[in-house]
């Protein structure tokens, strides 16, 4: 028979999305056992029929990658998990409505920090996503978010930071003391979607000034 409460077998069914990689995750409930199996279906919002996800039928792991199936930026999606215990009991739980644009979180950017004598240069590398354009190229975050910009901070000492920001990929902090260590942090910001990545951090030391030796 079906359990009184589906959460006995299945809990916390949700999408976890980072840089548009969309992973469905869930937990077993208190009555779940290691031999409980899970089957995953998904559908586009507005569609009637659910589609079984190949490779995620009768699995024992508690995650399923739905990146490809939920890759249209303009669509909304649902997914659901059906858990079946060894004793034949089953439970199904559905996610909240999922929008990758709205729900994806941003990973720290990939940055190269370059030391010079009196400056530190920071070069941000565009972040690829799994989403492919019509020409087959992978879209970057910059291709998706018009309002994406980079916020850069250089900790000069305990009380003073220098800030730069913009949509360019190359930045330079000038007027620094030679042979001195600095902490740089770089974040991706998308204000219109209230997104902010965790910072990339680089500890860099300006080069010694050899002109006086």
């Amino acid at each position: 028979h079906a359990p009184e409460d589906p959460s006995d077998l299945l809990q916390h069914v949700k999408f976890q999305s980072s840089n548009f990689e969309n992973i469905l995750t869930w937990d077993s409930g208190p009555e779940g056992t290691p031999d409980t199996v899970y089957s995953i279906e998904y559908k586009t919002y507005g569609e009637r029929d659910w589609v079984a996800k190949k490779g995620c039928q009768r699995i024992t792991r508690k995650s399923c990658n739905l990146t490809v199936e939920t890759g249209n930026l303009t669509e909304l999606y649902y997914a659901r998990v059906t858990a079946v215990s060894a004793g034949g009991r089953s439970a199904t739980k559905m996610t909240d409505r999922f929008s990758s644009l709205q729900h994806t979180t941003l990973k720290p950017p990939d940055v190269t920090c370059i030391s010079k004598v009196r400056s530190i240069q920071m070069i941000v590398h565009p972040t690829p996503t799994p989403i492919r354009a019509g020409d087959g190229h992978r879209l970057t975050l910059e291709d998706i978010f018009h309002d994406l910009f980079y916020h850069l901070e250089l900790q000069v000492n305990r009380t003073y930071q220098m800030h730069l920001g913009g949509k360019q990929r190359e930045y330079e902090f000038f007027g620094l003391t030679p042979d001195t260590e600095f902490l740089g942090t770089i974040m991706i910001c998308v204000p219109t979607w209230a997104k902010e990545s965790a910072p990339y951090m680089c500890r860099v030391k300006t080069l010694p000034d050899r002109t006086w030796t």
Partner: antibody, heavy 117, light 107 residues
Framework: EVQLVESGGGLVQPGGSLRLSCAAS????????MYWVRQAPGKGLEFVSV????????HYVESVKGRFTISTDNAKNTLFLQMNSLKSEDTAVYYC??????????WGQGTQVTVSS | DIQMTQSPSSLSASLGDRVTITCQAS??????LAWYQQKPGQAPKLLIY???RLQTGVPSRFSGSGSGTSFTLTISGVEAEDLATYYC?????????FGQGTKVELK
């Protein structure tokens, strides 16, 4: 050298349609943000629409939503603005512009659109 | 939408004068502000980006400052070729919006 050349402007009656074109060269058109910006006679500048030529993502200013459509032909390095249900307040010089290395630094010479009966 | 309030709307300057134009954003835009110069019959030309960074090829008499909501463009010694209309632009969020413009004329 980056070049943007607009065409397709002209005189049209209220309620009519026009299609503007912008031929681009000198940069990687198929991976850029492209803009239409307008300037009414004796007035300031207003961004109308933007498109990412790779993702196809578009945005419009509220006053033209549902009437204007921005699009590209990446094979021909051309940006378009289809303008329907034109109103007298759409009368302006229309510029195309592009964002290169994060900066909106390259503009065409503009094409005049006049909506009048 | 973010409103950009620019002042003054026009000013008269003598050659060599120091000229200051201000721009106020209706909300914080970090340092995502650019300044453009436009002459009659021409497209706008980028002078300053990132609130204070001088675009390549722009004379050093132009400078920008500010962050958050308050920004300033300064021309340290006006030359005849600087007589034009100047616009600030917020590049923080769509729709990108310009200030109303400041026309710099000869006194």
């Amino acid at each position: 050298e980056v070049q943007l050349v607009e065409s397709g402007g002209g005189l049209v009656q209220p309620g009519g349609s026009l299609r503007l074109s912008c031929a681009a060269s000198g940069f990687t058109f198929s991976s850029s943000w492209m803009y239409w910006v307008r300037q009414a006679p004796g007035k300031g500048l207003e961004f109308v629409s933007v498109i990412n030529t790779r993702s196809g993502i578009t945005h419009y200013v509220e006053s033209v939503k549902g009437r204007f459509t921005i699009s590209t032909d990446n094979a021909k390095n051309t940006l378009f603005l289809q303008m329907n249900s034109l109103k007298s307040e759409d009368t302006a010089v229309y510029y195309c512009a592009t964002r290169i290395q994060g900066l909106i630094d390259y503009w065409g010479q503009g094409t005049q659109v006049t909506v009048s009966s | 939408d973010i409103q950009m309030t620019q002042s003054p709307s026009s000013l008269s300057a003598s050659l060599g004068d120091r000229v200051t134009i201000t721009c106020q954003a209706s909300q914080s835009i970090s340092s995502l502000l650019a300044w453009y110069q436009q002459k009659p019959g021409q497209a706008p030309k980028l002078l300053i980006y990132g609130a204070s960074r001088l675009q390549t090829g722009v004379p050093s008499r132009f400078s920008g400052s500010g962050s958050g909501t308050s920004f300033t463009l300064t021309i340290s010694g006006v030359e005849a070729e600087d007589l034009a209309t100047y616009y600030c632009l917020q590049d923080y969020s769509w729709p990108l919006t310009f200030g109303q413009g400041t026309k710099v004329e000869l006194k």
